[in-house]
Amino acid sequence: SITGISPITESLASLSTYNDQSITFALEDESYEIYVEDLKKDKKKDKVLLSYYESQHPSSESGDGVDGKMLMVTLSPTKDFWLQANNKEHSVELHKCEKPLPDQAFFVLHNRSFNCVSFECKTDPGVFIGVKDNHLALIKVDYSENLGSENILFKLSEIHHHHHH
């Protein structure tokens, strides 16, 4: 369960892949598309508002127990739109929604080597946001083998003005 309804902190950042491709958001036919692309030098990186939440980590041994704390995030590239996991389609989509946000909008934030992070679906443990065919997709990861897979590693570059949207 998410401990507080309000975030513990917020941060404005640009999001890129391990291989330094930018995650960009484009309005097309009244809906937003998400792209993974090489940015031209003069083009500004798209900003994402990250809202951080403190959450209880459920115990693996007893389903009703608690095993410590974890950090969750929601990601909003533009007002009233949030990244959401579509577990049926194995896709990552931008949806307009009101608060309280659905569980599909929450991702466990993992601290990785090489100054990278990973985003794990709250609704589907072991499934991470990843890059597939120049798009974001949901990728199942076997912990004991592929936790370092480059396609689930992302870089966050903080932008210091907090003017979002």
């Epitope: 513990i8 410590g68 950090l71 934030l109 993992h110 601290n111 990785r112 083998e145 370092g148």
Partner: antibody, heavy 119, light 111 residues
């Protein structure tokens, strides 16, 4: 209940070797980053080494690089610290620690095992 | 490496009093908009126990009398009203970057 139990400490001569073990229970061991933190008698805490979940990455404090090796056996739920070329300044209580889920901070600590390096 | 300096080295207080402990970092411990500064309590013969993570968030089972604040390089641990079991050594620690470093500790002792 989440538990970490260290073993393998003892008295060893300078230049000698020792292998510490940490038996983990009560959680899905392979999903968590694990570390060793030490504390010299009457002194403060010093991080020694970390190994990520999935055995992908390891990191060490400079003073033990090339001498200590952190490893894990996820099938046995066990963390190890192989210590070679031991020095008097390695004398300390060695704690096994588990990161929180997501690897942001040391969340769970074992009771520690004492390593004494002396001739 | 990031050096953490705690003050005071020793704090002599009575049960019921308020304790304010300081931790200063040699450079910012902020990353991704998070202040990656944690606080631990250690009693004699025991391992450390996580009190506060990410500057201001209580660990599991930590009483509300413990609170953390601060950002950038300056952080504070406050114990609003000291209980007998709170007399111990307190360490701050940064998890922004390797090598992960600890402060030298503040001992809270009974006056």
């Amino acid at each position: 209940e989440v538990q970490l139990v260290e073993s393998g400490g003892g008295l060893v001569q300078p230049g000698g070797s020792l292998r510490l073990s940490c038996a983990a229970s009560g959680f899905t061991f392979s999903s968590f980053s694990m570390s060793w933190v030490r504390q010299a008698p009457g002194k403060g805490l010093e991080w020694v080494a970390t190994i990520s979940g999935g055995k992908t990455f390891t990191d060490y404090v400079d003073s033990v690089k090339g001498r200590f090796t952190i490893s894990r056996d996820d099938s046995k739920n066990t963390l190890y610290l192989q210590m070679n070329s031991l020095r008097a300044e390695d004398t300390a209580v060695y704690y096994c620690t588990r990161a929180n889920y997501g690897n942001w901070f040391f969340e769970v600590w074992g009771q520690g095992t004492l390593v004494t390096v002396s001739s | 490496e990031i050096v953490l300096t705690q003050s005071p080295a020793t704090l002599s207080l009575s049960p019921g009093e308020r304790a304010t402990l300081s931790c200063r970092a040699s450079e910012s411990v902020a990353k991704y908009g998070l202040s990656l500064l944690n606080w631990f309590q250690q009693k004699p013969g025991q391992p450390p126990r996580l009190l506060i993570f990410a500057a201001s968030n209580r660990g599991s089972g930590i009483p509300a009398r413990f609170s953390g604040s601060g950002s950038g390089t300056d952080f504070t641990l406050t114990i609003s009203s000291l209980e007998p079991e709170d007399f111990a050594v307190y360490y701050c620690q940064q998890s922004k970057e390797v090598p992960f470093t600890f402060g030298q500790g503040t001992k809270v002792e009974i006056k």
